[in-house]
Amino acid sequence: MKVLQEPTCVSDYMSISTCEWKMNGPTNCSTELRLLYQLVFLLSEAHTCIPENNGGAGCVCHLLMDDVVSADNYTLDLWAGQQLLWKGSFKPSEHVKPRAPGNLTVHTNVSDTLLLTWSNPYPPDNYLYNHLTYAVNIWSENDPADFRIYNVTYLEPSLRIAASTLKSGISYRARVRAWAQCYNTTWSEWSPSTKWHNSYREPFEQH
């Protein structure tokens, strides 16, 4: 049994780090493998993560963590029984993938303006809470070419757009994702999408 692709890990900078790797053949990850992780710190103890299958030869492990600080560094040991397959380290603050925003809502009752709001996925005491920026994706269910991205570079989790920038009388979907420049994070996953029917009054034309 050998590791084909070494574990790579990302942290949500809150409570979970996710490590993925590939074995050289089909593996029952949860019964055959264990990922041990330990904070490099005085009087810390090793903790065990039981991996799950992620495709035939792929494994994924969700490492439970305390709140993350930038100094944290972990040793990682991948074991198959008594055999050490791989040894590495992981610094969560250098591999951050934010949590996805939630509760995306489209408010359509504001005089021909669409107001999209969503929730910041972090509690106020988390460092990332005040450092997220967002991308909002809006697309038409009827027309694949009608696909747009709005970058929200301010902190408030909301976006206002004129309903008239979209076509009237058809359904649209929206989703949102987040990233944090301060830690040069990757983008989060997209939030679940939300759907609405776009309709607005055409301005009365005078001849």
């Epitope: 904070l39 710190f41 005085l42 009087l43 810390s44 103890e45 090793a46 903790h47 439970l64 963590m65 305390d66 600080v69 930038s70 100094a71 944290d72």
Partner: antibody, heavy 125, light 112 residues
Amino acid sequence: EVQLVESGGGLVQPGGSLRLSCAVSGFTFSSYAMSWVRQAPGKGLEWVSSITGGGGGIYYADSVKGRFTISRDNSKNTVYLQMNSLRAEDTAVYYCAKDRISITIRPRYFGLDFWGQGTTVTVSS
Amino acid sequence: DIVMTQSPLSLPVTPGEPASISCRSSQSLLYSIGYNYLDWYLQKSGQSPQLLIYLGSNRASGVPDRFSGSGSGTDFTLKISRVEAEDVGFYYCMQSFKAPYTFGQGTKLEIK
């Protein structure tokens, strides 16, 4: 009420051995690291050794490394210090102390917040 | 090893007056914001040491509020706002950031 009670001290000749015990009550013993600190007559405090709650992490002062062994029995709520090849300079009052919570991912530290009354070790011929 | 240096080593104080003890470490004891692994202990004559301050500035349970700790990195201070007769004894700073834990030499506080 948290209590730490050391025992096992006494008079021993140079090169001899002693085993100190520290019996604990009043907190979840297995969750906490434990430490031994000593104080030679008329001197300051000197850290000796520490052990994690699960017993997997062990640390020693250079002055005792290879001669002293720290261990714990979580079923008996007791931490031990086995002292071999004792020297005159090991003469001291030995205290055990409750250390940080070590079972969390990052150990939670609240100082050495409870100490035993101490047990005296005298190494002399 | 991290070397801890206390000053002064002797501190005569009039009751009711403030007192201050300095502790310097040879390496930073800061792990992350709010986590300086520096404690202060008081050992009264014939007694075991007792914890006063942990993580640089957190007062231990039952410790009077006249005791306070401050500082970060390598420079720390223990202050007693108004010394009382029962405060006499030896004060030690200790780092628990890296093994081996190391103590300062101790400061003897006595009443004038």
